[in-house]
Interface confidence: medium
């Protein structure tokens, strides 16, 4: 059985479209599961992995490897 584009698995009922945009950063494996691109995490691969050591409480990032501090916090790791 040949599945339509972006459909995978037995019965072709698993849907996955690779994307690299605001809504996710992932490829699809042979079973239609999302595999996050380097630097991204989460079920939709839309959460950037911040700079190693970045404070999870006082820092965040829009892009992988970044560490943006909340107001009132500073330093390389916002700690």
């Amino acid at each position: 059985v040949t599945c339509d584009d972006y459909y995978y698995g037995f019965g072709c009922n698993k849907f996955c479209r690779p994307r690299d945009d605001f809504f996710g950063h992932y490829a699809c494996d042979q079973n239609g599961n999302k595999t996050c691109m380097e630097g991204w995490m989460g079920p939709e691969c839309n959460r950037a992995i911040c700079r190693q050591g970045c404070s999870p409480k006082h820092g965040s990032c829009k892009l992988p490897g970044d560490c943006r501090c909340q107001y009132g916090w500073q330093g390389l790791y916002c700690d």
Partner: antibody
Framework: QVQLVQSGAEVKKPGSSVKVSCKAS????????MHWVRQAPGQGLEWMGA????????AYAQKFQGRVTITADKSTSTAYMELSSLRSEDTAVYYC????????????WGQGTLVTVSS | DIQMTQSPSSLSASVGDRVTITCRAS??????LAWYQQKPGKAPKLLIY???TLADDVPSRFSGSGSGTDYTLTISSLQPEDFATYYC?????????FGGGTKLEIK
């Protein structure tokens, strides 16, 4: 289970701003972007924009660019939509909505917030 | 931006009828299409996603089909609770636009 609970109805004057909140529960808030959709009385649905709560990245429909600001507070799992320079045409029900799992579109919706713009 | 054109804008039908609503995208949306049902004063409810997959707890009388730019929602045998407004929406790329809606009324 996933729940999105919005703030109450608002009446605003033309030229002012409104800020609608959407409190999420039943899932990890930072895992999914939160979208905002509005519906004017008797009209269709209009996508306004979205935010990635984890990092704060936003995407806006061009129509609302510069007038809408979507923010998120991770500590309270709450998303906000602020619309400025209000005019009578902005009278609408504003919904927050979230995608489902596995690339569903909008599977979860707030109850809606009616914003009335009137002098 | 991709525009969604939905037809008809309104439709009168009777219980037991088979009803078809169509949606045309201005570009190829690769099955990234959803259908919603909305009743007065309520938030929309997801019926179908990825053009043909039924959402949880949606009766099997609803079905979706199509590909490329043309998509269809079919209700095989109308029930009284199906009288509502239906919207299509693409989610291929932002902005995720909706069709104008189809109001399904009792004949």
């Amino acid at each position: 289970q996933v729940q999105l609970v919005q703030s109450g109805a608002e009446v605003k004057k033309p030229g002012s701003s409104v800020k609608v909140s959407c409190k999420a529960s039943g899932y990890t808030f930072t895992d999914y972007e939160m979208h905002w959709v509005r519906q004017a009385p008797g009209q269709g649905l209009e996508w306004m924009g979205a935010i990635q709560p984890g990092g704060g990245g936003t995407a806006y429909a061009q129509k609302f660019q510069g007038r809408v600001t979507i923010t998120a507070d991770k500590s309270t799992s709450t998303a906000y939509m602020e619309l400025s320079s209000l005019r009578s045409e902005d009278t609408a029900v504003y919904y927050c909505t979230r995608r489902g799992y596995d690339d569903y579109p909008f599977a979860y919706w707030g109850q809606g917030t009616l914003v009335t713009v009137s002098s | 931006d991709i525009q969604m054109t939905q037809s008809p804008s309104s439709l009168s039908a009777s219980v037991g009828d088979r009803v078809t609503i169509t949606c045309r995208a201005s570009g190829n949306i690769h099955n990234y299409l959803a259908w919603y049902q909305q009743k007065p004063g309520k938030a929309p409810k997801l019926l179908i996603y990825n053009a043909k997959t039924l959402a949880d707890d949606v009766p099997s009388r609803f079905s979706g089909s199509g590909s490329g730019t043309d998509y269809t929602l079919t209700i095989s045998s109308l029930q009284p609770e199906d009288f509502a407004t239906y919207y299509c929406q693409h989610f291929w790329s932002a902005p995720w636009t909706f069709g104008g809606g189809t109001k399904l009324e009792i004949k």
